[in-house]
């Protein structure tokens, strides 16, 4: 599982590179996305 | 291996409806995330929609908003797609994919190919 | 509105390079895309994701021969030693979630000729 700290904190990533990781995550975990 | 295999597609006359299928092996079905693309004669490619891994969550582009419907039958390993007010536009062939963590569109099935004609 | 504009064909000599772009609109320059291979009368195969710093990881069963790059707004398939196989359509996607809503967009496509 990738931690939202893990996303938040990784450096050189574009917005839309940690909002698609959340959601690719969200997808199979099904946690909320807002 | 991952399998995807698609079926239900076939001939509908305008303004009727068609539930297409696909068969999941290979994996734990219950896993992932599914979408289906789809791909019109000649023409490019368009996303249809995406499921979550337990069906809880649904997403659709506005050209199939309030038509077409995702859903999966994770006790059969099987992601449905019905299509209803189906429109000669909704002529394409409808591939099944497969998320992983890291893409959306990771494994694809071969397609079933849907004619819209009246 | 997140749009990928890509050239309609392009071609190489066998066991030469070609290098496919993928432009994404300008406000989405930082966005990470995916490649996809479509082979004559086949399913779309996944090749890669690609980063805005040229980061990438390919799909199952991709040859090395096979490397993405960025620049800007550009994102670049680059195809080294280019086979008979390797002649297929090669098209761009994009996904983002706006307000907790999924939209995904594809390229037209290149269409990669072997000479």
């Known amino acids: 599982a990738v931690s939202e700290h893990q996303l938040l904190h990784d450096k050189g990533k574009s917005i839309q590179d940690l909002r698609r990781r959340f959601f690719l995550h969200h997808l199979i975990a099904e946690i909320h996305t807002a | 291996q991952v399998q995807l295999v698609e079926s239900g597609g076939g001939v509908v006359q305008p303004g009727r409806s068609l539930r297409l299928s696909c068969a999941a092996s290979?994996?734990?079905?219950?896993?992932?995330?599914m979408s289906w693309v789809r791909q019109a004669p000649g023409k490019g490619l368009e996303w249809v929609a995406t499921?979550?891994?337990?069906?809880?969550?649904?997403y659709y582009p506005d050209s199939v908003k309030g038509r077409f419907t995702i859903s999966r039958d994770n006790s059969k390993n099987t992601l449905y797609l019905q299509m209803n007010s189906l429109r000669a536009e909704d002529t394409a062939v409808y591939y099944c994919?497969?998320?992983?963590?890291?893409?959306?569109?990771?494994?694809w099935g071969q397609g079933t190919l849907v004619t819209v004609s009246s | 509105q997140l749009v990928l504009t890509q050239s309609p064909s392009a071609s190489a000599s066998l066991g030469a390079s070609v290098k496919l772009t993928c432009t994404l609109s300008?406000?989405?320059?930082?966005?990470?895309i995916e490649w996809y291979q479509q082979q004559p009368l086949k399913p779309p195969k996944y090749v890669m994701d690609l980063k805005q710093d040229g980061s990438h990881s390919t799909g199952d069963g991709i040859p090395d021969r096979f490397s993405g790059s960025s620049s800007g707004a550009d994102r670049y398939l680059s195809i080294s030693n280019i086979q008979p196989e390797d002649e297929a359509m090669y098209i761009c996607g994009v996904g983002d979630t706006i307000k907790e809503q999924f939209v995904y967009v594809f390229g037209g496509g290149t269409k990669v000729t072997v000479l």
């Open positions: 994919a497969r998320q992983t963590t890291m893409t959306y569109f990771a494994y």
């Open positions: 499921i979550s891994s337990g069906g809880s969550y649904t």
């Open positions: 290979g994996f734990t079905f219950s896993s992932y995330g």
């Open positions: 300008s406000q989405h320059s930082t966005y990470t």
